[in-house]
């Protein structure tokens, strides 16, 4: 009786379970009753990760550097190509195909979470009591001046872009 | 017990035709591939041609590839090899060898195909 | 098709001996290769399947082992029944082919 199933790791043609080519294989002749599947290694920049049927394996990732790409681990017969971005840039998206520049937090926003390779920076405003008056990727939001601590009084408040500036007490007379 | 048993060889002239028969018993024939390996005196072992358990499959080597036709009656428990156009290097013992899983496990006692004139 | 290549063609040995026989492929095989053996005037006998595996009712004295392109039987005594040629047969790539032999003679 033919089978209509096939273990793990085999595939069903012409009524025969037939092994599947392994990782870093492709596939060149189906099995018969009498030879087993035909596989072939997958050539330079080439690969497949996974038990497969495949006649032909996938090309690797290029990474191209016109795009901000460099590649961060590279491929093998089994693994495709990670490319991941320059410094001071982040990919656009899980599969990295593109980079763009971190986007800077503007002034009255400071920097919560650093850009990384594969994420933006993440911005929050600033909270009273703190400014940022540059427009950064990697500045925090800073706290206003303590003027008491320096024996000053507060001649202008504080905003979320500016600092306190503080000034000599008034002196009795 | 499984028994695998040819016959059918002889002398026959270069160009002409011989059919051999391999008769089986002991065992569920259809559900089983089966083949022809020969072996020319004092050589090496050569496989001809194998057929799957339904007859939808059938394997030539090269050598006998346009000339021999190997087929089955699972209802007689009989597998054949029809051989046409004869030649001298098809003088060879002919074995007849059940298929189970990639191997040969059993095989019959031979046949000797003389192709002369 | 994959041409097998077997080493040595002939070996002497006595009863006792250790005996290896190699076979080589022209591509890669991966393990699948069967080992028989042949007496004069008898049809072949399955003796190693896919490599490393014993045939049932074959003496635990024989093992196969390889993969790849380089395949070995190995006979760890030597017993007078055992002299005989030797084939291997690979089931890689169609048609399945045998190597040429490897005849174990008494010394």
């Known amino acids: 009786e033919p089978p209509t199933a096939c273990r793990e790791k085999q595939y069903l043609i012409n009524s025969q379970c037939c092994s599947l080519c392994q990782p870093g294989q492709k596939l060149v002749s189906d099995c018969t009753e009498f030879t087993e599947t035909e596989c072939l290694p997958c050539g330079e920049s080439e690969f497949l990760d996974t038990w497969n049927r495949e006649t032909h394996c996938h090309q690797h990732k290029y990474c191209d550097p016109n795009l901000g790409l460099r590649v961060q681990q590279k491929g093998t017969s089994e693994t495709d190509t990670i490319c991941t971005c320059e410094e001071g840039w982040h990919c656009t998206s899980e599969a990295c195909e593109s980079c763009v520049l971190h986007t800077p937090c503007i002034p009255g926003f400071g920097v919560m979470e650093m850009a990384t390779e594969t994420t933006d920076t993440v911005c929050e405003p600033c909270p009273v009591g703190f400014f940022s008056n540059v427009s950064s990727a990697f500045e925090k939001c800073h706290p206003w001046t303590s003027c008491e601590t320096k024996d000053l009084v507060v001649q202008q408040a504080g905003t979320n872009k500016t600092d306190v500036v503080c000034g000599p007490q008034d002196r009795l007379r | 017990e499984v028994q695998l048993l040819e016959s059918g060889g002889g002398l026959v002239q270069p160009g002409g035709s011989l059919r051999l028969s391999c008769a089986a018993s002991?065992?569920?024939?259809?559900?089983?591939?089966m083949s022809w390996v020969r072996q020319a005196p004092g050589k090496g072992l050569e496989w001809v041609s194998g057929i799957g358990g339904s007859s939808s499959y059938t394997s030539y080597a090269d050598s006998v590839k346009g000339r021999f036709t190997i087929s089955r009656d699972n209802s007689k428990n009989t597998l054949y090899l029809q051989m046409n156009s004869l030649r001298a290097e098809d003088t060879a013992v002919y074995y007849c060898a059940r298929y189970y899983s990639y191997h040969m496990d059993y095989w019959g006692q031979g046949t000797l195909v003389t192709v002369s004139s | 098709d994959i041409q097998m290549t077997q080493s040595p063609s002939s070996l002497s040995a006595s009863v006792g001996d250790h005996v290896t026989i190699t076979c080589r492929a022209s591509?890669?095989?991966?393990?699948?290769l069967n080992w028989y053996q042949q007496k004069p005037g008898k049809a072949p006998k399955l003796l190693i399947y896919a490599a490393s595996s014993l045939q049932s009712g074959v003496p635990s004295r024989f093992s196969g082992s390889g993969s790849g392109t380089d395949f070995t039987l190995t006979i760890s005594s030597l017993q007078p029944e055992d002299f005989a040629t030797y084939y291997c047969q690979q089931y890689g790539s169609a048609p399945p082919t045998f190597g040429q032999g490897t005849k174990l003679e008494i010394k």
């Open positions: 002991g065992f569920t024939f259809s559900s089983y591939a």
């Open positions: 591509q890669s095989i991966s393990s699948y």
